[in-house]
Interface confidence: medium
């Protein structure tokens, strides 16, 4: 984050940004930036694998929900979108693309279909869905 | 926008940002930044006047919808929230807090109640509502 203090000292007061304001990012052009994470909603429908590939091609991953506080903008998302959560049949757990396990109490998992992938829906709900079904999707890029 | 080129030259290549990435803002801390506009969703319910006052106290205004392209993140907003659109009885038009008139084809206005204020809902819909009814609200700050 480019804090106001840093920018003001850097530019010798030429950039007048209130101390409570800050820059967010960096993010890919025209993505949403929130609490230094980048998000983009894609409204062309793809299956889970194609959605994952699309995010990867943009140096991002499918949405990972890791914090209700840091990601509270997700509360108000309308409709259903692929996220990066997949079912691991061998141990029955749900895990993210990066291999981390879904933390308890983060998502309410709802069995909508028999499947191994999950759609994100408002208020931190995850809907189980067949991975080959086309849906819109959310890509996410965590800034360093 | 702090472009990658500018930042790279400023910091002598220490900050490695892809050329397609950029910073967004500045925005108030923890607000959503998108296409260099700042947004925040407030989930305490207030009437229109209180909502307006809350936004103003944060150096912002209630949501103004001015472009479907620049504000396409609003397509996916769930629920109903006060925006800065009010009915002007003298000429029957709807205008924003800044005095500008609602452009045609930006919002589909829907008769929900008799009133002089409007709630924003997903897919660029505006719902007529009595200004004294408490609702959640969206504040917006346009960056220069």
């Amino acid at each position: 984050i480019w804090s106001a203090v840093f920018l003001n000292s850097l530019f010798n007061q030429e950039v007048q940004i209130p101390l409570t304001e800050s820059y967010c990012g960096p993010c890919p052009k025209n993505w949403i930036c929130y609490k230094n994470n980048c998000y983009q909603f894609f409204n062309e429908s793809k299956n889970w694998y194609e959605s994952q590939a699309s995010c990867m091609s943009q140096n991002a991953s499918l949405l990972k929900v890791y914090s209700k506080e840091d990601q509270d903008l997700l509360k108000l998302v309308k409709s259903y979108h692929w996220m990066g959560l997949v079912h691991i049949p061998t141990n029955g757990s749900w895990q993210w693309e990066d291999g981390s396990i879904l933390s308890p109490n983060l998502l309410t998992i709802i069995e909508m279909q028999k499947g191994d992938c999950a759609l994100y829906a408002s208020s931190f709900k995850g809907y189980i869905e067949n991975c080959s079904i086309p849906n819109t999707y959310i890509c996410m890029q965590r800034t360093v | 926008i702090w472009s990658a080129v500018f930042l790279n030259s400023l910091f002598n290549q220490e900050v490695q940002i892809p050329l397609t990435e950029s910073y967004c803002g500045p925005c108030p801390k923890n607000w959503i930044c998108y296409k260099n506009n700042c947004y925040q969703f407030f989930n305490e319910s207030k009437n229109w006047y209180e909502s307006q006052a809350s936004c103003m106290s944060q150096n912002a205004s209630l949501l103004k919808v001015y472009s479907k392209e620049d504000q396409d993140l609003l397509k996916l907003v769930k629920s109903y929230h006060w925006m800065g659109l009010v009915h002007i009885p003298t000429n029957g038009s709807w205008q924003w807090e800044d005095g500008s008139i609602l452009s045609p084809n930006l919002l589909t206005i829907i008769e929900m109640q008799k009133g002089d204020c409007a709630l924003y809902a997903s897919s660029f819909k505006g719902y007529i509502e009595n200004c004294s009814i408490p609702n959640t609200y969206i504040c917006m700050q346009r960056t220069v």
């Epitope: - | 029957g92 709807w94 206005i109 008769e111 008799k114 719902y127």
Partner: antibody
Framework: QVQLQQSGTEVKKPGASVKVSCKAS????????LTWIRQAPGQGLEWMGW????????NYSLKFQGRVTMTADTFTNTAYMELRSLRSDDTAVYYC??????????????WGQGTLVTVSS | AIRMTQSPSSLSASVGDRVTITCRAS??????LGWYQQKPGKAPKLLIF???NLESGVPSRFSGSRFGTDFTLTISSLQPEDFATYYC?????????FGQGTKLEIK
């Protein structure tokens, strides 16, 4: 083009109920309210109330409160007005009209052709 | 309820005449008033909304104006098809109320 097509003439006995329908076409039904207005023979127009088709919420004139029910079926794009405990002075042509509040759209810019309800013993 | 007092209740005029019909509201109603034309056996037709706005497709000889709580419908040059009954309607608050009507007849 916008059309509101109402159901046909009704003859009812005092104390009975009548349900008039109004089928909308040519526009997005849920965007506009739907109002009911009546006109007794040789008399002026009387506003009965309107329903927000979007959320099904009605606003009735106090005169008809308790006797009238306005509903809207968004699957068939049809609005209904039911009037109960009919009296002879309910004999009138009943109109549906597009619009509910007049706060954005011109109020009552399209009307049904009217349904004559005669209450007679 | 807001009372809308419409005058005159009837009016005889000739083709080409300028005609004025007035509605007075019993309290302030902003610009929340419309004018409607009704011919025998037909549904009313919207002419003017929000006091002075001409509905699309309505001839420009019709106009509306407001002065305080007095609202006026003016027909600048009467045409044969204008002979009908005219009503005002307030939609400022519930219950919406119509004026009692003005019957415009051929002299």
């Amino acid at each position: 083009q916008v059309q509101l097509q109402q159901s046909g003439t009704e003859v009812k006995k005092p104390g009975a109920s009548v349900k008039v329908s109004c089928k909308a076409s040519g526009y997005t039904f849920t965007t506009y309210g739907l109002t009911w207005i009546r006109q007794a023979p040789g008399q002026g127009l009387e506003w009965m109330g309107w329903i927000s088709v979007f959320n099904g919420s009605p606003n009735y004139s106090l005169k008809f409160q308790g006797r009238v029910t306005m509903t809207a079926d968004t699957f068939t794009n049809t609005a209904y007005m039911e009037l109960r405990s009919l009296r002879s002075d309910d004999t009138a042509v009943y109109y549906c009209a597009r619009g509910g509040t007049g706060d954005y759209y011109p109020l009552f810019d399209y009307w049904g052709q009217g349904t004559l309800v005669t209450v007679s013993s | 309820a807001i009372r809308m007092t419409q005058s005159p209740s009837s009016l005889s005029a000739s083709v080409g005449d300028r005609v004025t019909i007035t509605c007075r509201a019993s309290q302030g109603i902003r610009n929340d008033l419309g004018w409607y034309q009704q011919k025998p056996g037909k549904a009313p037709k919207l002419l003017i909304f929000a006091a002075s706005n001409l509905e699309s497709g309505v001839p420009s000889r019709f106009s509306g104006s407001r002065f305080g709580t007095d609202f006026t419908l003016t027909i600048s040059s009467l045409q044969p098809e204008d002979f009908a009954t005219y009503y005002c309607l307030q939609d400022y608050n519930y219950p919406y109320t119509f004026g009692q009507g003005t019957k415009l007849e051929i002299k």
